[in-house]
């Protein structure tokens, strides 16, 4: 009880005049505060609390929620207390089942006794289970029994206050803790898609996937360098009791040019915050960008394979390609695919398999392609190699010796003149005509050369050479000559 | 003791606007997820729109989404709802909600409700 | 959206008999995140049950709650004058939030 200083207030005096007060329930509490400048009584237990403006309070009858703490107040402010248990075989606990704990925090049970003298007053679990080993806690008959540091793991747990009375233990209603967990990460964030094309008008929709321990981490859609709030709708699940799930959804109704760039989806929790981005890229019309993966003028050997390979940017996606050669559309021998299976993939591959190519099927090979706004092409010239083929080879009534070669490219005819029987020619002879015979005709194919030489000049018997030759290899063609006396009596031309 | 005390309810024409108050007292606000609930007369409850304690999660039901918005204010204890292009089919009792300590959605404390009336 | 149906709309019996009604969802309700409201006339409802079993503080335990996935039971082993309610599921598992259309349980 409180001494008295003589000049400052003191607090009241409480009779009778202890700290603790046994009563056994049926009995009466009395209580008397002692002070001139008297206010009120207060009593308080679990929540609850009651007030008396009597300087005595009276129970008559004593139940055992009566138990807790009465505190006499006066004028000053200045107050003394004291704490009555209520003795009640039948009822050795009062329990407010509540029970609700923050984690890495202690928290109370709050089962305070009726009788301060039973033994072992601790907590057990529910049905005979045992309690979590690490499960640490401090028993306060007055309070109840504190849990400390709550763990994850004890959410949803199912215990009882316990005691021994009398050589018996009793056990308290059950309580289940509930635990909000602490945050001990940043939020996971991830957009259903890295970035968006879309052409004026269409609607732009983006989902921001946010997971967290609880409901509360904070989200939010925000653009890149702007403070405009933007209009986003959220979904959220509880997959489990620490594993909740929100999505957040951006969505702009008629997208416009204007609205192109970034989009960021934050998201934080008292531990610290993430991010990520999506980028909007938004067209007044779709478009059609083709790129050769070869040269567009392709030279190939006769009887080998080319491939004619495009990639092409399409958007909105390519509806008609095709391969094209002399107004003919191919079939087959072609294959078109996307370059990734990416849900945003623009960008296409389309491949021709010329196979086994004839020096007649050079030409000018289109690959046209369109979608819903666009269309485009690309040509690809293709010139086959072809060894040169001697066409004719003749003596003319002038007496010249004529020569005409075809191949691609254009053949060099050159003439040797071999003294006697011999096929190995060396000495060379100038050609008196050579022209190419279809330099104005189509663009591709082979080209046609006549090459002539006088064959007056040649005043011994022997053979004369024509070869013809080119990048891709050599034909030769040979006439015989044969002198009787001053004539020339026999020419025979042969390969 | 917790308590939630709505307001602001009251008869309204079509397409006309009002403000729902919820005060709440009697725990600490700010670490609550809150939710409105209506219930059209003689009618079954209907979830309207959920706010997070830190106000970083909104949700509204199909049938509000675009006029009614819900926020909260953790310093004077109040949650509201903003009713704009009121409809007949919005006349109802609406009922703020507290959702329990570690758990949104589940709501273990209701106030008694203020009756909105959307009428010409 | 989850859709809650509860059936039967009405129940009618005598005090003292066991009282079951039904809730079933249109899909699965994970971690049983699914709850039972009591609604008396002229008052706001009031949490019997959650987490599909657990009786929430100060609730009698005549009370009772059972199911998992779809299906779910709210049991009321005796029935009292004072239990005259209609009585709510609701699911917390995902928005939105959806209520069943209610059991409204009278005394025969």
């Known amino acids: 009880q409180p001494s008295v200083s003589p000049g400052e207030p003191s607090p009241p005096s409480i009779h009778p005049a202890k700290s603790e007060l046994i009563v056994r329930v049926g009995n009466e509490i009395r209580l008397l505060c002692i002070d001139p400048g008297f206010v009120k009584w207060t009593f308080e237990i679990l929540d609850e609390t009651n007030e008396n403006k009597q300087n005595e309070w009276i129970t008559e009858k004593a139940e055992a929620t009566n138990t807790g703490k009465y505190t006499c107040t006066n004028k000053h402010g200045l107050s003394s207390s004291i704490y009555v248990f209520v003795r009640d075989p039948a009822k050795l606990f009062l329990v407010d089942r509540s029970l609700y704990g923050k984690e890495d925090n202690d928290t109370l049970v709050r089962c305070p006794l009726t009788d301060p003298e039973v033994t072992s007053y601790s907590l057990k679990g529910c049905q005979g289970k045992p309690l979590p080993k690490d499960l640490r806690f401090v028993p306060d008959p007055k309070a109840g029994i504190t849990i400390k540091s709550v763990k994850r793991a004890y959410h949803r747990l199912c215990l009882h206050c316990s005691a021994d009375q009398e050589g018996k233990s009793v056990l308290s209603d059950k309580f289940i803790l509930k635990v909000r967990p602490a945050f001990k990460a940043v939020p996971v964030v991830s957009v259903s898609k890295a970035s968006y094309l879309l052409r004026e008008g269409e609607e732009f929709t983006v989902t921001c996937t946010i997971k967290d321990v609880s409901s509360s981490v904070y989200s939010t859609w925000k653009r890149e360098n702007s403070q405009t709030k933007l209009q986003e709708k959220y979904n959220s699940w509880h997959h489990g009791d620490f594993n909740y799930e929100r999505q957040a959804t951006l969505t702009i109704s008629s997208a416009r040019v204007n609205d192109s760039g970034v989009f960021m989806c934050y998201a934080n929790n008292t531990f610290g915050s993430a991010n990520v981005t999506t980028t909007l890229e938004v067209v007044d019309k779709g478009f059609i960008n083709i790129f050769p993966m070869i040269n567009t003028t392709v030279f190939v050997n006769d009887g080998e394979n080319v491939d004619l390979i495009v990639e092409y940017e399409a958007f909105p996606k390519p509806e008609h390609q095709q391969w094209i050669y002399m107004n003919r559309t191919f079939t087959d021998k072609w294959e078109d695919y996307p370059k990734s299976e990416n849900e945003s993939n623009i960008r296409y591959v389309s491949e021709l398999h010329l196979t086994r190519l004839k020096g007649t099927e050079g030409g000018t090979y289109t690959f046209l392609v369109s979608n819903s706004d666009v269309n485009a092409s690309i040509a690809f010239n293709v010139y086959v190699n072809t060894k040169p083929e001697i066409l004719t080879y003749d003596r003319l009534v002038n007496g010249m010796l004529q020569c005409v070669a075809a191949g691609f490219p254009e053949p060099t005819i050159d003439w040797y003149f071999c003294p006697g029987t011999e096929q190995r020619c060396s000495a060379s002879v100038l050609p008196v005509d050579v022209q190419t015979l279809n330099a104005s005709g189509p663009p591709f194919g082979k080209l046609v050369v006549q090459s002539s030489i006088d064959s007056s000049a040649f005043k011994h018997n022997g053979t004369v050479e024509c070869k013809a030759y080119n990048d891709v290899g050599k034909t030769s063609a040979y006439f015989n000559f044969a002198f009787k006396g001053n004539n020339k009596e026999q020419i025979h031309p042969h390969t | 003791e917790v308590q939630l005390l709505e307001s602001g309810g009251g008869l309204v024409q079509p397409g006309g606007s009002l403000r729902l108050s919820c005060a709440a007292s009697g725990f600490t606000f700010s670490d609550y997820g809150m939710s409105w609930v209506r219930q059209a007369p003689g009618k079954g409850l209907e979830w309207v729109s959920a706010?997070?304690?830190?106000?970083?999660?909104?949700y509204y039901a199909d049938s509000v989404k675009g006029r009614f918005t819900i926020s909260r204010d953790n310093s004077k204890n109040t949650l509201y709802l903003q009713m704009n292009s009121l409809r007949a089919e919005d006349t109802a009792v609406y009922y703020c909600?507290?959702?329990?300590?570690?758990?949104?959605?589940?709501?273990?404390?209701w106030g008694q409700g203020t009756l909105v009336t959307v009428s010409s | 959206e989850i859709v809650l149906t509860q059936s039967p709309g009405t129940l009618s019996l005598s005090p003292g008999k066991r009282a079951t009604l039904s809730c079933r969802a249109s899909?699965?309700?994970?971690?049983?995140?699914l709850a039972w409201y009591q609604q008396k006339p002229g008052q706001p409802p009031k949490l019997l049950i959650y987490?599909?079993?657990t009786r929430e503080s100060g609730v009698p335990d005549r009370f009772s709650g059972s199911g998992s996935g779809t299906d779910f039971t709210l049991t009321i082993s005796s029935l009292q004058a004072e239990d005259v309610a209609v009585y709510y599921c609701?699911?917390?598992?995902?928005?939105?939030?959806?209520f069943g259309g209610g059991t409204k349980v009278e005394i025969k």
């Open positions: 899909q699965s309700v994970s971690n049983s995140y």
């Open positions: 909600a507290k959702d329990t300590w570690w758990l949104a959605g589940l709501f273990d404390y």
């Open positions: 987490w599909a079993s």
């Open positions: 609701q699911q917390y598992y995902s928005t939105p939030l959806t």
């Open positions: 706010i997070g304690y830190g106000g970083g999660g909104k």
